[in-house]
Amino acid sequence: ELCDDDPPKITHATFKAVAYKEGTMLNCECKRGFRRIKSGSPYMLCTGNSSHSSWDNQCQCTSSAARNTTKQVTPQPEEQKERKTTEMQSQMQLADQVSLPGHCREPPPWENEATERIYHFVVGQTVYYQCVQGYRALHRGPAESVCKMTHGKTRWTQPQLICTGETEPSQFPGEEEPQASPDGLPESETSR
């Protein structure tokens, strides 16, 4: 079940996911001056079974100016399966990292993709928040949000995070901005 809304917006903060639940969709967005190829899928989809999850479809961008002489900047269809396998294998090369069951990892980049990715999340997805550069975090609780189903409707829990300018007085004296912990998760996730 897709979440009806985007995760909550927190002023001066961004959110990220560690992994993506099956059913998540990623828009195939291209940078300025490029567009999705006509035969290309508009999105990638996280699919899988009990033992393995992966992204279906591939995003491909081509120059907006190109006409009949369009040069594909990603593999031709017959090459895609082999290339995709290689790309996915290349993502797994860090040792001691176990994939979450029922989740896809971050899809590899594609040529000329837009800088910011647009995901459509499903119920059960968790995203994590941090303040942007130049702002510090004031916490009342975990800086995360979970998409939940309540009475047949989806909603995101409210992350307990306020981001304040570094020169502004703290509302919660003694609180420091948490640095990400060694495994890459925000402190609120690892210290509960």
């Epitope: 990220k16 990292q97 990892r105 800088t115 550069q133 640095q179």
Partner: nanobody, 125 residues
Framework: QVQLQESGGGLVQAGDSLRLSCAAS????????MGWFRQAPGKEREFVAT????????YYADSVRGRFTISKDNAKDTLFLQMNSLRPDDTGVYYC??????????????????WGQGTQVTVSS
């Protein structure tokens, strides 16, 4: 302010290994994707490898896949590039780069907002 300082470059023989490091400061290193790029003499800067904010996922240029390994230590604010089976065409200045706030990967130069000064790697045959 944001600072990225590469180290570990040098002159090696073909087939040797090198490990580059990039010490980061002035930003929340654990929250950002990072990348390595290189520039050979007379050529444009090109993508080498990138890693997501968590350090879980990596991606490589075809020319280095299977020989180079990117990693990041979020506890020590340091990015690494382990380079094995070096070849003469790996010669160049290697730069580490910080991904923009909302970028998932440091894959293209557009994805990055801060760069180190670079470290020279020379591979002789």
């Amino acid at each position: 302010q944001v600072q990225l300082q590469e180290s570990g470059g040098g002159l090696v023989q073909a087939g040797d290994s090198l490990r580059l490091s990039c010490a980061a400061s002035g930003f929340n290193f654990g929250w950002h994707a990072m990348g390595w790029f290189r520039q050979a003499p007379g050529k444009e800067r090109e993508f080498v490898a990138t890693i997501t904010w968590t350090g879980r996922d990596t991606y490589y240029a075809d020319s280095v896949r299977g020989r180079f390994t990117i990693s990041k230590d979020n506890a020590k604010d340091t990015l690494f590039l382990q380079m094995n089976s070096l070849r003469p065409d790996d010669t160049g200045v290697y730069y580490c780069a910080k991904a923009r706030e909302r970028a998932t990967w440091a894959y293209s130069e557009d994805d990055c907002d801060y760069w180190g000064q670079g470290t020279q790697v020379t591979v002789s045959s």
